[in-house]
Interface confidence: medium
């Protein structure tokens, strides 16, 4: 570590005296600059010497010497006071810039340590400090305003009592800059714009920032627009607003508009698209299939997406039949606006009843005309089964009728014993009817099919079961013969062994 002679840490001299400061180290040493022109600097082997033949109050400051080759980076310092009876202060800088909440050092150095007891900080021309100004003083460094606030950006003077009289330093201007958290906040209104050729349009680009030092511009595609700027200040933020007003739009006005704002922290931009059309439009679409199938008792939401300009003048859901003349309840119809020109309309159909199957149409109107989108709703039902014993062409026949949607398929089972339902262990024979006869198949209604099992003799201690199933469920009907003597003759193509 280098050593300074005289040993210090402080040296007090009078103006006009000669001052010599010698720094000695193991290797080469140097004085931390900048050294004022009043000093002469020369090297003498491993030492460096600063000397002045005519010390002035402006030589008052801390002189530090370092040894560049020292791996520990040690340094030595001495503080020189040149106590001028007329000059209590040496001001090292007339402007100090800090960010809010940083400590601000006002570098007025006292030229005579004896005066320390009578120092104070005032604003220019002896005005008192603002309330809540928290400061401290160091004779080596000056006044420190702790955690400086924006409002404390003022002109200050350092004051010292000399012979009962306050003597001021020259003024120091403190600038306290607001901490800019990021690029300016932006809004571009509207987020999307559609106009018919010849209509008027307005696009507003506004930016706000914590201080006034920021720029904002509006760009159309790649062209920067020259628009007058309106400025304002509210909510502790500076606002800059650019308004593009177009009296009669044409196709060349269409395209991408970007609002761009920048400050010291960077740039922020947001964009919108302006579409110019020849005439009004109204488009209806759905992400759903227009043909819907739902199990009876369940619910369904029918959704229609609408894209329109100008806005809708009317819309409604209509039930087109074929069953009752009921209409959807308004409370079940819901409209949501995704943005200015796109809307979603939903019809909620909870716990669907048989009479609610059929066609549902969404109709909408704007100056471009009427449009409609129709859904076809078919209800699914699990099969309902019934078996009767009848004679057809003199032959005894089991007749199974199954009704449901989708169309049920039919299986016959013969099993041992009397039972309500055949289980696997009891099954003696199974017949699958590949083509049951369709008795009725009307739109939006159940499909009814019929399957025949011709019986010559029915075994007395056996059960004959007709089973029907579809994607919704299954149903069955067991038939137990009352008298013996008949035998069954299923068609050949029906027969298989389980």
């Amino acid at each position: 570590i280098p050593v300074i002679e005289p040993s210090g840490p402080e040296l007090v001299v009078k103006p006009g005296e000669t001052v010599t400061l010698r720094c000695v180290g193991n290797g080469s040493v140097e004085w931390d600059g900048p050294i004022s022109p009043h000093w002469t600097l020369y090297s003498d082997g491993p030492s460096s010497v600063l000397t002045t033949n005519n010390a002035t109050f402006q030589n008052t400051r801390t002189y530090r010497c370092t040894e560049p080759g020292d791996p520990l980076g040690g340094s030595a310092a001495i503080h020189l006071y040149v106590k001028d009876p007329a000059r209590p202060w040496n001001v090292l800088a007339k402007e100090v810039v800090v960010f809010e909440d940083q400590d601000a050092l006002l570098p007025c150095l006292l030229t005579d340590p004896v005066l320390e007891a009578g120092v104070s900080l005032v604003r220019l021309r002896g005005r008192p400090l603002l309330r809540h100004t928290n400061y401290s003083f160091s004779p080596w460094h000056g006044f420190i305003i702790h955690r400086a606030k924006f409002i404390q950006g003022q002109d200050y003077q350092c004051s010292a009592l000399m012979g009962g009289r306050k003597v001021m330093s020259i003024s120091i201007r403190l600038k306290v800059q607001k901490v800019i958290p990021g690029p300016p906040a932006l809004t571009l209104v509207p987020a999307e714009l559609v106009r018919i050729r010849g209509e008027a349009a307005q696009i507003v680009c506004s930016a706000s920032n914590i201080d006034v030092d920021f720029d904002v511009f509006l760009q159309h595609n790649t062209t920067k627009l020259a628009i007058p700027q309106r400025s304002d200040f509210h909510d502790n933020r500076y606002q800059k607003v650019l308004t593009l007003s177009l009296g009669q739009v044409d196709f060349q006005h269409a395209g991408n508009y970007s609002c761009v704002a920048s400050n010291v922290q960077g740039k922020h931009s947001t964009s919108m698209f302006f579409r110019v059309v020849e005439s009004a439009y109204l488009d209806l679409s759905s992400e759903q299939n227009l043909i819907q199938e739902v199990t009876v008792g369940e619910g369904l939401n029918l959704k229609v997406m609408v894209e329109a300009y100008p806005g809708l003048q009317g819309f409604n859901w209509t039930y087109l039949g074929p069953f009752s003349d009921h209409q959807p309840e308004p409370k079940l119809a819901n409209a949501t606006t995704k943005d200015t020109y796109r809307h979603t309309f939903t019809l909620s159909l909870p716990r669907l009843k048989p009479s609610e199957a059929g066609r549902y149409s969404f109709l909408a109107r704007n100056p471009g005309g009427w449009r409609a989108l129709t859904f076809e709703l078919t209800l699914r039902y699990p099969p309902e089964v019934s078996v009767i014993w009848t004679s057809i062409n003199g032959s005894g026949t089991l007749l199974c009728a199954a009704s449901g949607y989708p169309q049920p398929n039919v299986t016959w089972l013969q099993c041992a014993g009397h039972t309500d339902r055949c289980d696997e262990a009891q099954v003696l024979q199974v017949w699958v009817d590949p083509h049951p006869e369709v008795l009725s198949q009307e739109p939006f209604q159940k499909v009814t099919v019929q399957s025949l099992l011709t019986a010559e003799t029915l075994e007395h201690n056996q059960t004959y079961e007709c089973r029907a199933h579809n994607s919704v469920g299954s149903g069955s009907w067991a038939f137990i013969p009352i008298s013996a003597g008949a035998r069954t003759h299923p068609p050949d193509e029906f027969l298989f062994t389980p």
Epitope: Q58, R87, N90, V91, K94, E95, L124, R125, G126, L130, F150, I151, G153, Q154, D155, Q157, M168, I170, S171, R173, K175, V176, D211, V212, D213
Partner: antibody, heavy 122, light 111 residues
Framework: QVQLVQSGAEVKKPGSSVKVSCKAS????????IIWVRQAPGQGLEWMGD????????NYAQKFQGRVTITADESTSTAYMELSSLRSEDTAVYYC???????????????WGQGTLVTVSS | EIVLTQSPATLSLSPGERATLSCRAS??????????LAWYQQKPGQAPRLLIY???NRATGIPARFSGSGSGTDFTLTISSLEPEDFAVYYC?????????FGGGTKVEIK
């Protein structure tokens, strides 16, 4: 080029108030103090007060303390001087001036407004 | 409070002549090697115009015939050769400490 444009001449009754505006263009408004100076007919220049537009803090000459209010709107780059309880001796040309960028020497006025004549008469 | 006294109150000269205007401060306006004094020119019906700051530095665009000198309490504005447009009132101003004060002015008129 920096320009300071002041509001037009005013005729006021004694006891009333006057508010003079000074709009700056062509420079960074917040960087320099705005200083108000007045000049009575045939008289010299008299400092009234000043404002730091950067944070809105104003200083007033002792003579005008309590009667003058200096404000600045950084968003429109405009400074205002309002003088209340007017009397006939307040008849003067009121100037706004901008402090120059001479950091070694604060309160040197390098740009001036054209002046606003305020006449106080009953 | 520092008072600035200008003399003479009126100076009658012809174009081409040298004008010497004085400004005296009631106490020193120099500090740390700087002189806190400025000079302004004012023509009838116009706003003042900055000529000199720091006692001797010419402001932007000011012709070389205008020069300032002095330190401490005594300051001088010199116009080496008067042009017709130089006939006006000249004010000195204390530009840093205490009050922002002006001298009473010196009128330079055509003889």
């Amino acid at each position: 080029q920096v320009q300071l444009v002041q509001s037009g001449a005013e005729v006021k009754k004694p006891g009333s108030s006057v508010k003079v505006s000074c709009k700056a263009s062509g420079g960074t408004f917040s960087s320099y103090y705005i200083i108000w100076v007045r000049q009575a007919p045939g008289q010299g220049l008299e400092w009234m007060g000043d404002i730091n537009p950067y944070n809105g803090t104003a200083n007033y000459a002792q003579k005008f303390q309590g009667r003058v209010t200096i404000t600045a709107d950084e968003s429109t780059s405009t400074a205002y001087m309002e003088l209340s309880s007017l009397r006939s001796e307040d008849t003067a040309v009121y100037y706004c001036a901008r402090e120059g960028p001479y950091f070694s020497n604060l309160y040197v006025m390098d740009y001036w407004g054209q002046g606003t004549l305020v006449t106080v008469s009953s | 409070e520092i008072v600035l006294t200008q003399s003479p109150a009126t100076l009658s000269l012809s174009p081409g002549e040298r004008a010497t205007l004085s400004c005296r401060a009631s106490q020193s306006v120099s500090y740390q090697g700087e002189n806190y004094l400025a000079w302004y020119q004012q023509k009838p019906g116009q706003a003042p115009r900055l000529l000199i700051y720091d006692a001797s530095n010419r402001a932007t665009g000011i012709p070389a015939r205008f020069s300032g000198s002095g330190s401490g309490t005594d300051f001088t504005l010199t116009i080496s050769s008067l042009e017709p447009e130089d006939f006006a009132v000249y004010y000195c101003q204390l530009s840093n400490q205490d009050l922002l004060t002006f001298g009473g002015g010196t009128k330079v008129e055509i003889k």
